[in-house]
C-alpha cells in the first residue's frame, strides 16, 4: 500500500514570498507523484512547480494559489493511488488602490456645506488600519469636522468647506506590510475668493527659431493676479523681461508667446495664479526644443527568393517622437500588400528578384528629417557559364580546372579534390573567377575534381577527371657517382616512366661496347666480376615513341672497400698518463682516418696540446683526465666507402700502494703505462 | 481473485450510443485508477480516457464530448458511455487497472 | 495533441539477434520518465514488459530492457527468442492525467 510519510498541511504564507507543501510517500514500488488544485492537475510553472514530491512556490499569489491543495500517488503498474490531506494557503497580502469619491455621485455635485465621503481602495488580508492624509498631512480621528470609517475605509467629510480643499490621499497598514493610494483625489471645495485653474498650460515642443505658446488663466472673486516665472524664478513681464526671454509676450488673457525659440528658451515655465484669499496656484509647463539624431547604417542585406523577410529600421532619438516610413524607388510603402511597411518594419513576402534595390527608411519631427538606405539583393542560385571538363595536364606544369557560374550576389566556389576540401596552398589557387590552378602537376594529382558554387539561395556543382600526362623521366635519377668494388659482382640500376613504358640501355660514354663479362638487363647494368677496367662514364638511356629520349650519365669508380689493419682496443689509463688508441685502416681510394670522441668530432686543427693524431691514423692524448673517458671512434673513408670501429677509454685514479703489497705487484686491470 | 471483465460491447447503428461496463472483483474501486483503451482490427492501441481513485475523469482529445467514463462503487463496476458512433470507432475496448492488469476486452461494431 | 512516433513500423529479424526500437514523444512525459512498454500477440491483450523507462515488469525476462529520458526511449531485446516475434507499443503519461500510445513496431521473422 502506499503510505504518505509526509503530508501537505495548511499555511500562512505571504503574497509574493517562497512556500513550499511537502509530501513524502512510502511505497513497494516506484510511484508517480503529481498535485491537484481544487481537484485539477496542477502543471508546472517557473512560479509554481514540483520539487521531488513536494509542491515549491517561487512566490505565492492570492489569486492563483487559493482553493485546495492535494498529494495524489499513483503506482501506475498496479494502478493504486492515494491522496494525501487538504492543504491550503492564509495569503497574507496588501494591494495598493485609488483614493475616489463616494458621496456626492460626482465632483460636479460637490458644494460648500454637502457632506462628502471619500473611500480608501486599499485592500488586504488580514484587513488593514487606515490612515488620512491632505496634502500630506495626517488627519487625526475625531477631529470635529470630519470622521474615519476604518471598516469602510471612508473619510466623511460634514459639512465640507473651502479650508476641506486639498489633495487626499490614504495609506493602509497590516501583519503583511504598508501601501498607499496609487492614486490621489484634488477635492476642490469653490470660495469665490480662492484663484481656481481655467485653463493650464501644456507642454509643448517646437522647432529652433519657431513661435511656442503657453495658455493659462485662473478665475475668482475679484480677479486673480497672474504671474509667469521661468526656470530661474525670473518673472516675465511685458515691463521687465530677462536678458534671454527679450522676444517673450504676456497677453492680457495670461497667454506667453515665444518667438524666435532658441535653446535656451528651453526649460520649465510656471503660471501662478493668486486669489484675494488661499494658496497660490502654480502650474508648470515645459518648453522642448525639437531634436533628431542621426540614423544608424544599414548592413547590406542579402535574401533568398521565395522567402520572407524583414528589415528593423530604429527610429532616431529625438523628439517629438519621429515618424517613420520606408520608400522604395522614391514611393512610400503601403501598409498591407506583398511589400509592406509594419510598425517600423519593411516586410517583404514571397521575395522576388524584382525586389532586389534600395529602400530608404525616413525619419521625421518638427527638428527635420533623416534617412538611411538599404541595399536589398535578392540572392539566385547560380547558372553554369562554363563547367569544368575532363583534362588531361602535363606533369610539372601549370593545369587549369573551369568553374565559371554567375549568380547574385557573386558565388562562392570552393573545389574538392577526392571528396576533400582543396584549401589554397603553395600548389592550389583558386582565382575570383572560380578557376582552379594547380601550379606543377604530380602523376598523384590525376583524379576527380569537384567544384561548388553557391549563394545564400542554393548551389550547383560538377565534376571532371583530370588525367596526367607524365614526363619522360628517370625514377629515380641515377646518382652521378658510384663506386664498385674490385674482384666482387656489381649491378647498376636505372629505370624510367613516361606516357608510354621507355626502353633502358646503357652505354659507355666513348661509344665502346660493354665487355661480355658486363649485361644490360632491363635497364640494370650487371657486371659479374669488377675490374679495374671497368670504371670510367656510362650513360644510360630512357627512350619512347612520342617522348623521345633522355639520358643520365653514371661515373663507375672500381675501389677496394676500406678494412681496419688494426683497431682500437678497450683502454684504461692512469689518470695524468698518456693514452694511445691505434687505428690503421686500408683500401683503394687510401682512406683517409677520422676519429669521433664522446659524440663529437676531433678537428685535427682544433685539438690542443694534449691531443694528438699520427699519420698513421692514431690518437694519443697526453696528461689525461677523468673527464677524457668515454667512448672513442675511429672512422675510415673514402669516396666509395666509410666504416668505423670503437672502444672505450677509462680514466682512473692511481692507487696508493698498500703496506702488505710490494712496489712491484702488479695493478688489478690491464694499464698501458708509460 | 483480481480480475476484470468487460461487457456491453455488440453491433451498433452509426449516431447510436453504447454503454460498456468492466466489472471489478478482487479489490475497490476507491483506491484504484481505472483506464479504457481501444484497439481498432487490425490497428494500434488508442487511449481513451481514466478515471481516478476520486472519480474525477480525463480524456484524449478526440474523446471528449462523445464519451463519458462513470463508476458505480457499491457495484464496484466502471462504465464507458459512448454517444454519436461512427464507424471509425468499431474495436475491441479494454478496460485496464493501471498498466499491469487488463481485461479480456469487448467488440464494438458501428454499422448499418 | 501528443503524438507518439515509434520506428521502425515493421522490423524483421532472426532468432539471437539485437533488436533496437525507438519511441519519441511529441513532448516530455511525466517526471521525464513515465514511459511504457508493452507486448501484443493477436487476439491478446497486452502484456507489460517495461515500467517507468527501465523497470522490468515481473516475470518479464532479462533481454528485454528500456532507457531513455524526456521524450526520446529505446526497448532493447538483447537476443532475441522465438516467443518474441510480436507486436510492440510504447505508452507515455503526461502532465494533467494524459496518456498516449505509439502506433507500435510489428516484429517478425526475417
Known amino acids: 500500500a502506499i503510505v504518505f510519510i509526509k503530508q501537505p498541511s495548511s499555511q500562512d504564507a505571504l503574497q509574493g514570498r517562497r512556500a513550499l507543501l511537502r509530501c513524502e510517500v512510502e511505497a513497494p514500488g516506484p510511484v508517480h507523484v503529481y498535485w491537484l488544485l481544487d481537484g485539477a492537475p496542477v502543471q508546472d510553472t517557473e512560479r509554481r512547480f514540483a520539487q521531488g514530491s513536494s509542491l515549491s512556490f517561487a512566490a505565492v499569489d492570492r489569486l492563483q494559489d487559493s482553493g485546495t491543495f492535494q498529494c495524489v500517488a499513483r503506482d501506475d503498474v498496479t494502478g493504486e493511488e492515494a491522496r494525501s490531506a487538504n492543504a491550503s494557503f492564509n495569503i497574507k497580502w496588501i494591494e495598493a488602490g485609488p483614493v475616489v469619491l463616494k458621496h456626492p455621485a460626482s465632483e460636479a455635485e460637490i458644494q460648500p456645506q454637502t457632506q462628502v465621503t471619500l473611500r480608501c481602495h486599499i485592500d488586504g488580508h488580514p484587513r488593514p488600519t487606515y490612515q488620512w492624509f491632505r496634502d500630506g498631512t495626517p488627519l487625526s480621528d475625531g477631529q470635529s469636522n470630519h470622521t474615519v470609517s476604518s471598516k469602510e475605509r471612508n473619510l466623511t467629510l460634514r459639512p465640507a468647506g473651502p479650508e476641506h480643499s486639498g489633495l487626499y490621499s490614504c495609506c493602509a497598514h497590516s501583519a503583511f506590510g504598508q501601501a498607499c493610494s496609487s492614486q490621489n483625489f484634488t477635492l476642490s471645495i469653490a470660495d469665490e475668493s480662492f484663484a481656481r485653474v481655467v485653463l493650464a498650460p501644456q507642454d509643448v515642443v517646437v522647432a529652433r527659431y519657431e513661435e511656442a505658446m503657453f495658455h493659462c488663466q485662473f478665475s475668482a472673486q475679484p480677479p486673480p493676479s497672474l504671474q509667469w516665472l521661468f526656470e530661474d524664478e525670473t518673472p516675465i513681464t511685458n515691463r521687465s523681461r530677462p536678458p534671454h526671454l527679450r522676444r517673450a509676450t504676456v497677453f492680457a488673457n495670461g497667454s506667453l508667446l515665444l518667438t524666435q525659440v532658441r535653446p535656451r528658451n528651453a526649460g520649465i515655465y510656471r503660471c501662478i495664479g493668486q486669489g484675494q484669499r488661499g494658496p497660490p496656484i502654480i502650474l508648470e509647463a515645459t518648453l522642448h526644443l525639437a531634436e533628431i539624431e542621426d540614423m544608424p547604417l544599414f548592413e547590406p542585406r542579402v535574401f533568398t527568393a521565395g522567402s520572407e523577410e524583414r528589415v528593423t529600421c530604429l527610429p532616431p532619438k529625438g523628439l517629438p517622437e519621429p515618424s517613420v516610413w520606408w520608400e522604395h524607388a522614391g514611393v512610400r510603402l503601403p501598409t498591407h500588400g506583398r511589400v509592406y511597411q509594419k510598425g517600423h518594419e519593411l516586410v517583404l513576402a514571397n521575395i522576388a528578384e524584382s525586389d532586389a534595390g534600395v529602400y530608404t527608411c525616413h525619419a521625421a519631427n518638427l527638428a527635420g528629417q533623416r534617412r538611411q538606405d538599404v541595399n536589398i539583393t535578392v540572392a539566385t542560385v547560380p547558372s553554369w557559364l562554363k563547367k569544368p571538363q575532363d583534362s588531361q595536364l602535363e606533369e610539372g606544369k601549370p593545369g587549369y580546372l573551369d568553374c565559371l557560374t554567375q549568380a547574385t550576389p557573386k558565388p562562392t566556389v570552393v573545389w574538392y579534390r577526392n571528396q576533400m576540401l582543396i584549401s589554397e596552398d603553395s600548389r592550389f589557387e583558386v582565382f575570383k573567377n572560380g578557376t582552379l590552378r594547380i601550379n606543377s602537376v604530380e602523376v598523384y594529382d590525376g583524379t576527380w575534381y569537384r567544384c561548388m558554387s553557391s549563394t545564400p539561395a542554393g548551389s550547383i556543382e560538377a565534376q571532371a577527371r583530370v588525367q596526367v600526362l607524365e614526363k619522360l623521366k628517370f625514377t629515380p635519377p641515377p646518382q652521378p657517382q658510384q663506386c664498385m668494388e674490385f674482384d666482387k659482382e656489381a649491378t647498376v640500376p636505372c629505370s624510367a616512366t613516361g606516357r608510354e613504358k621507355p626502353t633502358i640501355k646503357w652505354e659507355r660514354a666513348d661509344g665502346s661496347s660493354l665487355p661480355e663479362w658486363v649485361t644490360d638487363n632491363a635497364g640494370t647494368l650487371h657486371f659479374a666480376r669488377v675490374t679495374r677496367d671497368d670504371a670510367g662514364n656510362y650513360t644510360c638511356i630512357a627512350s619512347n615513341g612520342p617522348q623521345g629520349q633522355i639520358r643520365a650519365h653514371v661515373q663507375l669508380t672500381v675501389a677496394v672497400f676500406i678494412t681496419f689493419k688494426v683497431e682500437p682496443e678497450r683502454t684504461t689509463v692512469y689518470q695524468g698518463h698518456t693514452a694511445l688508441l691505434q687505428c690503421e685502416a686500408q683500401g683503394d681510394p687510401k682512406p683517409l682516418i677520422q676519429w669521433k670522441g664522446k659524440d663529437r668530432i676531433l678537428d685535427p686543427t682544433k685539438l690542443g696540446p694534449r691531443m694528438h693524431i699520427f699519420q698513421n691514423g692514431s690518437l694519443v692524448i697526453h696528461d689525461v683526465a677523468p673527464e677524457d673517458s668515454g667512448r672513442y671512434t675511429c672512422i675510415a673513408g673514402n669516396s666509395c666507402n666509410i666504416k668505423h670501429t670503437e672502444a672505450p677509454l677509462y680514466v682512473v685514479d692511481k692507487p696508493v700502494p698498500e703496506e702488505s703489497e710490494g712496489p712491484g705487484s702488479p695493478p688489478p686491470y690491464k694499464m698501458i703505462q708509460t | 481473485e483480481v480480475q476484470l471483465v468487460e461487457s456491453g460491447g455488440g453491433l451498433v447503428q452509426p449516431g447510436g450510443s453504447l454503454r460498456l461496463s468492466c466489472t471489478a472483483s478482487?479489490?475497490?474501486?476507491?483506491?484504484?485508477?481505472m483506464n479504457w483503451v481501444r484497439q481498432a482490427p487490425g490497428k494500434g492501441l488508442e487511449w481513451v480516457g481514466i478515471i481516478d481513485s476520486s472519480g474525477s475523469t480525463y480524456y484524449a482529445s478526440w474523446a471528449k464530448g462523445r464519451f463519458t467514463i462513470s463508476r458505480d462503487t457499491s457495484k464496484n463496476t466502471v462504465y464507458l458511455q459512448m454517444n454519436s458512433l461512427r464507424a471509425e470507432d468499431t474495436a475491441v475496448y479494454f478496460c485496464?487497472?493501471?498498466?499491469?492488469?487488463w481485461g479480456q476486452g469487448t467488440l464494438v461494431t458501428v454499422s448499418s | 495533441e501528443i503524438v507518439m512516433t515509434q520506428s521502425p513500423s515493421t522490423l524483421s529479424a532472426s532468432v539471437g539477434d539485437r533488436v533496437i526500437i525507438t519511441c519519441q514523444s511529441s513532448q516530455s512525459v511525466y517526471n521525464n520518465n513515465l514511459l511504457a512498454w508493452y507486448q501484443q500477440k493477436p487476439g491478446k491483450a497486452p502484456k507489460l514488459l517495461i515500467y517507468y523507462t527501465s523497470n522490468l515488469a515481473s516475470g518479464v525476462p532479462s533481454r528485454f530492457s528500456g532507457s531513455g529520458s524526456g521524450a526520446e526511449f529505446t526497448l532493447t531485446i538483447s537476443s532475441l527468442q522465438p516467443d518474441d516475434f510480436a507486436t510492440y507499443y510504447c505508452?507515455?503519461?503526461?502532465?494533467?492525467?494524459?496518456?498516449?500510445f505509439g502506433q507500435g513496431t510489428k516484429l517478425t521473422v526475417l
Open positions: 505508452q507515455g503519461g503526461y502532465n494533467g492525467n494524459i496518456y498516449a
Open positions: 478482487g479489490f475497490s474501486l476507491h483506491n484504484y485508477v
Open positions: 485496464a487497472r493501471g498498466l499491469y492488469l
